[in-house]
């Protein structure tokens, strides 16, 4: 006999990276018929929602109107059908950004390179932080973590056209409080390659929104940044 229900999906709209004082909605999608959803923050009960009518609703939203550092952290949700509770969702790391200062991002040898050339990004921030994050806009949304007193190095190694795209970096004051984003740096990778198969270029998101897209899961289409979020959050953990 089944003792728990399948875990729900959790994600943030419009994004898990939320500028301070901006709004964010945490979405939890379970099953039709769920009579109660609980949102947990840092292991403690944070909010409860009871959808009406439960048989027609399989998703609830928890609205945060004014993001700040106290609201940043790890969220999870569970739901109940009758007396039976679900497994907890994966953890959602909600990050507050635009804290304190703005880092500077540069790339060596330059923003335009040849396929196969070794490329290194440098993220510099003079305020007190020792962790830096480099993010590439795009579907695969690679996130790298680096360390340094005022500057971190992010070696990409020999690049291919798959590395083309727009990059930004953040200074991280803790896992869930990040600086303003750096100005974007667009990396162009040119070069004719003989007998080399290269990965296709990543689609890139509009720089102002960091994008939205659809992710196919076993339960259908999940809107927004679930894959993107999980990539970054696995790194955070």
């Amino acid at each position: 006999q089944q003792q728990t229900l399948p875990k729900p999906f959790i994600w943030a709209e419009p994004h898990f990276m939320v500028p301070k004082e901006k709004q964010v909605t945490i979405c939890c999608q379970g099953n039709y018929g769920a009579v109660e959803y609980q949102l947990h923050f840092e292991g403690s009960l944070f909010a409860v929602d009871r959808p009406k009518p439960p048989e027609r609703i399989n998703k609830v939203q928890f609205y945060i109107p004014d993001m700040n550092s106290r609201m940043a952290g790890q969220y999870s949700c569970i739901y109940r059908v009758g007396e039976l509770w679900s497994e907890p969702s994966n953890l959602l790391d909600l990050v507050v950004t635009e804290m304190y200062d703005t880092p500077t991002l540069s790339v060596h040898p330059g923003p335009e390179v040849i396929s196969g050339e070794k490329v290194t990004f440098y993220c510099r921030l003079d305020t007190a932080t020792s962790m830096f994050l480099l993010l590439k806009e795009g579907r695969s949304s690679h996130v790298q973590r680096g360390y340094g007193k005022v500057q971190a190095e992010f070696p990409l190694g020999p690049v291919t056209t798959a590395h083309r795209g727009t990059y930004r970096c953040f200074g991280s004051y803790n896992n869930h409080a990040w600086s303003f984003p750096s100005e974007p740096v667009k990396l162009l990778v040119t070069g004719d390659i003989e007998n080399t198969s290269l990965a296709p270029e990543d689609p890139t998101f509009p720089a102002d929104t960091w994008g939205t897209y659809l992710l196919t899961t076993e339960t259908g289409l999940q809107k927004d940044h679930a894959l993107w979020d999980h990539t970054a959050q696995n790194l955070l953990r």
Epitope: P109, I114, G116, E117, K118, P158, L188, G191, I193, T196
Partner: antibody, heavy 116, light 107 residues
């Protein structure tokens, strides 16, 4: 010590081709792209193109596409530039230069004279 | 293509002078600007990278400044061996381009 040793001066006839070499030592050849720069007599520097030795990726100045072909031989850590259909306009000193961000090391230059 | 414009074309100096060489890019290149010195019958030599970063083995009298589209190479006390042509180079976008050069000569 990083060194880029270029082949000697060339005197060739119009319409011919020539292949200039740049033998490197003192660093890992595949870790830096190699570039070629033209300097006509009394003139400034012109970037011809560059090549990444590890996978052979190339980028050319549009002006030199069809004129120059860049290749490498990883086994001997040598870069090559072939120039074809030569005319008097191609008479110049040609340099190879390693791109370590900037062009941090240069060959001594190869003088090419195209004359009948 | 990014056009690099250097001025003056020629600079006549006296040893001990402090001199400034100018380089202007036709569009912003951030700090992806490099300076080279070329003495007569020699290969170019890197002096300053990324607008202001010094190079090991280059005398400290050479310094660079600027960002965006306007850059300056300064020599704070010219020595006779500094005679030659100085080139700036766009390291931002392909095709990589050089300025026409500033010729430094002694009076």
């Amino acid at each position: 010590e990083v060194q880029l040793q270029q082949s000697g001066p060339e005197l060739v006839k119009p319409g011919a081709s020539v292949k200039i070499s740049c033998k490197t030592s003192g660093y890992t050849f595949t870790e830096y792209t190699m570039h070629w720069v033209k300097q006509s007599h009394g003139k400034s520097l012109e970037w011809i193109g560059g090549i990444s030795p590890n996978i052979g990726g190339t980028s050319y100045n549009q002006k030199f596409k069809g004129k120059a072909t860049l290749t490498v031989d990883k086994s001997s850590s040598t870069a090559y530039m072939e120039l074809r259909s030569l005319t008097s306009e191609d008479s110049a000193v040609y340099y190879c230069a390693r791109r370590g961000g900037s062009f941090d090391y240069w060959g001594q230059g190869t003088t090419l004279t195209v004359s009948s | 293509d990014i056009v690099m414009t250097q001025s003056p074309a020629t600079l006549s100096v006296t040893p001990g002078d402090r001199v400034s060489l100018s380089c202007r890019a036709s569009q912003s290149i951030s700090d992806y600007l490099h300076w080279y010195q070329q003495k007569s019958h020699e290969s170019p030599r890197l002096l300053i990278k990324y607008a202001s970063q010094s190079i090991s083995g280059i005398p400290s009298r050479f310094s660079g400044s600027g960002s965006g589209s306007d850059f300056t190479l300064s020599i704070n006390s010219v020595e006779p061996e500094d005679v030659g042509v100085y080139y700036c180079q766009n390291g931002h976008s392909f095709p990589l381009t050089f300025g026409a050069g500033t010729k430094l000569e002694l009076k």
